[in-house]
């Protein structure tokens, strides 16, 4: 196991997950850690505890390794980091990777007020409701700018979008969470259509899909541990 030293001179590795940081309960996920070609060992940590290690074979590419989680559960959802060793030196820690398990317990209802088809500039609010009490709700947009909004609430949360622009059009789903990394089943999708303006923008995004595998999240992380360029909207106003 890696020993903490003050002289962690090697650059930190990059960590990411495939196919997504959001994994349906029982499904598999790959966690990749990319360090250096000279790396002799990679170590993966989960919630601060030693999780797995890999010693890459010289015959293969040694600058990255894959850790396979065969069945994602609430016990494997949380924060992962990785390190690598080269010679006697260890790297700094990677940025944290937050893995979320979905498909737990119940399915929320999602609807939009005043209606799914609105004119440019109209005020729109999404509502997410879950029968089983939860602590937080998440609203996600498919195939778009990967916005994730979250709101605290017991059985319902509202997500005011304000005056909508064409950037708001697209397909949305919501989740209830039992903790930050354990989420409900996804709601049925709601597609927001925007009409009006100079051009006819009422078309929904092409090829909308109900599969979470098609959600395009940027899986690299920044210093805060949030997904870079995901434009997390962290509204924590109490309902």
């Amino acid at each position: 196991q890696r020993i903490n030293t003050e002289k962690e001179t090697l650059p930190k590795p990059i960590i990411w997950a495939k196919p997504s940081i959001m994994v349906t309960n029982g499904n598999s996920v790959n966690i990749w850690c990319q360090g250096a070609q000279s790396a002799s060992e990679y170590q993966l940590y989960f919630e601060g505890s030693f999780f797995a290690l890999e010693r890459p074979k010289p015959s293969r590419s040694m600058n990255k390794v894959r850790f396979f989680i065969s069945q994602m559960t609430s016990h494997t959802a949380g924060i992962y980091t990785c390190f690598y060793q080269s010679g006697e030196l260890w790297s700094k820690s990677s940025n944290p990777l937050k893995l979320v398990v979905t498909g737990l317990y119940d399915t929320p209802n999602l609807w939009v007020y005043p209606r799914p088809e609105v004119t440019l500039g109209e005020n729109v609010t999404f509502f997410c409701q879950l029968k089983t009490a939860t602590s937080k709700f998440f609203l996600l947009k498919e195939r778009g700018s990967n916005h994730i909004q979250n709101k605290y609430g017991n059985i319902q949360a509202e997500f005011p979008m304000g005056p909508v622009t064409r950037a708001h059009r697209g397909t949305y789903r919501c989740f209830g969470s039992y903790n930050d990394y354990a989420w409900s089943f996804p709601s049925e999708p709601v597609t927001l259509l925007i009409t009006g303006g100079v051009e006819n923008s009422s078309l929904a995004p092409t090829d909308p899909t109900s599969s979470l595998d098609y959600w395009e999240f940027d899986l690299s992380t920044n210093e805060s541990g949030l997904q870079k360029d995901s434009a997390f909207w962290d509204h924590t106003t109490q309902n």
């Epitope: 989960f46 505890s49 030693f50 999780f51 797995a52 290690l53 890999e54 010693r55 890459p56 074979k57 390794v65 894959r66 850790f67 396979f68 989680i69 065969s70 069945q71 559960t73 016990h75 494997t76």
Partner: nanobody, 126 residues
């Protein structure tokens, strides 16, 4: 579905040896990473040793140099050879598997394992 059955436990004197076996059902054994964990009375389950599908191994500091993990893919079995046993090694020993896995990953955390045996008791006493 994978089933794991441990055997080889028993009572032994300090300094003695035992070999635990874990027989796995199914044809996926060669693609499994395997591990041994133990739980002493009144304590939490702890990692003992693990082996990757490509025979890389890793040991808890407390057993390093005394215990050896190995596998025989032809027999679908993983072994834990225990020597220089101490009173503090007394515990129920569990075999666990990560099925499937890839590469040469060695899993140390119990949450990584998706199949578990029922355990075999090892008692070390004079």
């Amino acid at each position: 579905e994978v089933q794991l059955v441990e055997s080889g436990g028993g009572e032994v004197q300090p300094g003695g040896s035992l070999r635990l076996s874990c027989a796995a059902s199914g044809r996926t054994f060669a693609s499994a990473a395997m591990g041994w964990f133990r739980q002493a009375p009144g304590k939490e389950r702890e990692f003992v040793a693990a082996i990757s599908r490509s025979d890389d191994t890793y040991y808890a500091e407390s057993v390093k140099g005394r215990f050896t993990i190995s596998r025989d893919n032809a027999k679908n079995t993983v072994y834990l050879q225990m020597s220089s046993l101490r009173a503090e090694d007394t515990a129920v020993y569990y075999c666990a598997a990560v099925v499937p896995t890839y590469g040469s990953s060695i899993y140390v955390h119990s949450a990584a394992y998706n199949y578990w045996g029922q355990g075999t008791l090892v008692t070390v006493k004079p």
